[in-house]
Interface confidence: low
């Protein structure tokens, strides 16, 4: 059930002092691009730096992830930090810098000889042997061990969406993330609000593809804001 | 095959109205997933969006420019038009039309632009 | 509306040498594309949604990039690739289509 899988010993259970947001695993999609803060130069002088904000990692650049800049701080308030070299703390993947990935709390080099074994590791822990299904999905993702080779595919486990191959974009399934297909015009989108407070999302949608963003379905402007839907329209 | 070609006065005076043409074949605006946009660039610089039309009839413009800006299309004569209002010095450069698409986007098709 | 900063603003190779340029979203976007401008002409699409190469584009130019970070490659530069290189993507909000301010290649 539902309860079982958010009950699970998973990611999201972890303590929030390394600057990963309770309740924010790394998601890796969503709002439509730049829809979240337009504007600001994050490459800027030292001098001159200006933090970031950002709702989730893919707003951030390869080289870093999204989180809360102190410990146990205002998980409303995030920037773009510098992703953690290997053998550096971590609480999620995204946290690693490319090459690496998280396991046991530590970024590990992604060996595509063991990479795929420790995943699916991580998942069957998270969820136990019970390979139910939820929503239609079985509960073991199967994970490709070609990743670093070619561009992943739909299904292919992924870090981020530069992982994925083109139309496809790096999404959570439950406590890994794969390459979904980026949503087309007239799908239903996720649209986050600005602070990045969007809890634990089991599945994520990709965000909107190339010239369509995220908004509340024109019919459904009177509805209550809890029930708005919102799809991928035209620019 | 597909060809655009752009159209306009050459010369205005300050706070004028730019009336400028796209005339095009090879495509059709009433077909599902076209547009034509226009795109500026003054002499020597960069380019610079301006505003484009879908085959629906929707608009995007410029935010910058908005106030000033307006396209409008006619499908039966295959031609998209831009006007801009208040023209000064700065609006002078060469303006291009050109074919965007729903899958993939971007600008495929260009005509030579006029000065 | 998000900023596309391209470098280097100007640039030099010799025939047959590897070119990489740049392009920075000062947000992050969906998709990249890249247009080859010469002198007296209109531009041309070479890459669409990141690293597609649009039709007739020789498979020397390559693109690819995620988030605020992309680039064009050519592989080896010939000397028809001399050119002004612009970056463009679509932002969502607000809706708007924005360019780099764009890299000039030259022939050694």
């Known amino acids: 059930t539902l309860n079982s899988v958010l009950n699970s010993n998973a990611i999201k259970n972890l303590p929030p002092p390394l600057g990963g947001a309770a309740g924010h695993p790394g998601s890796a999609v969503s709002a439509a691009p730049g829809i979240l803060y337009p504007g600001g130069n994050k490459y800027q002088t030292i001098d001159n730096y200006q933090p970031y904000p950002c709702a989730e990692d893919e707003e951030c650049g390869t080289d870093e992830y999204c989180a809360s800049p102190t410990r146990g701080g205002d998980a409303g308030v995030q920037i773009c930090l510098a992703c953690r070299k290997r053998r550096k703390r971590c609480m999620r993947h995204a946290m690693c810098c490319p090459g690496n990935y998280c396991k046991n709390g530590i970024c590990v080099s992604s060996d595509q000889n063991h990479f795929r074994g420790e995943i699916e590791e991580t998942i069957t822990e998270s969820f136990g042997n019970d390979h139910s299904t939820l929503d239609g999905y079985s509960r073991r993702t199967t994970l490709s061990s070609k990743m670093y080779h070619t561009k992943g595919q739909e299904g292919s486990v992924c870090l981020r969406s530069s992982d994925c191959a083109s139309g496809l974009c790096c999404a959570r399934h439950f406590w890994s993330k794969i390459c979904k297909p980026v949503l087309k015009e007239g799908q239903v989108c996720t649209k986050h609000r600005r602070k990045g407070s969007h809890g634990l999302e089991i599945f994520q949608r990709c965000y909107c593809g190339e010239g369509l963003s995220c908004r509340i379905q024109k019919d459904h402007h009177q509805a209550s804001n809890s029930s708005r839907l919102h799809t991928c329209q035209r620019h | 095959q597909v060809t655009l070609k752009e159209s306009g006065p050459g010369i205005l005076q300050p706070s004028q109205t730019l009336s400028l043409t796209c005339s095009f074949s090879?495509?059709?605006?009433?077909?599902?997933?076209?547009?034509v946009g226009w795109i500026r660039q003054p002499s020597g610089k960069g380019l610079e969006w301006l505003a484009h039309?879908?085959?629906?009839?929707?608009?995007r413009y410029n935010p910058a420019l908005k106030s000033r800006l307006t396209i409008s299309k006619d499908t039966s004569s295959s031609q998209v038009f831009l006007k801009i209002a208040s023209v000064d010095t700065t609006d002078t450069a060469s303006y291009y039309c050109?074919?965007?698409?729903?899958?993939?986007?971007?600008?495929?098709?260009w005509g030579q632009g006029t000065l | 509306q998000i900023v596309l900063t391209q470098s280097p603003v100007i640039m030099s190779a010799s025939p047959g040498e590897k070119v990489t340029m740049t392009c920075s979203a000062s947000?992050?976007?969906?998709?990249m594309y890249w247009y080859q401008q010469k002198p007296g002409s209109s531009p041309r699409l070479l890459i669409y949604d990141t690293s597609n190469l649009a039709s007739g584009v020789p498979v020397r130019f390559s693109g690819s990039g995620s988030g605020t970070s992309y680039s064009l490659t050519i592989s080896r530069m010939e000397a028809e690739d001399a050119a002004t290189y612009y970056c463009?993507?679509?932002?969502?909000?607000?809706?708007?289509?924005?360019f780099g301010a764009g890299t000039k290649l030259e022939l050694k």
């Open positions: 039309i879908w085959w629906d009839d929707v608009k």
């Open positions: 947000s992050s976007v969906s998709y």
């Open positions: 090879g495509f059709s605006l009433s077909t599902s997933g076209m547009g």
């Open positions: 463009q993507q679509w932002s969502s909000y607000p809706p708007a289509l924005t």
């Open positions: 050109s074919r965007i698409a729903r899958s993939p986007t971007g600008f495929a098709y």
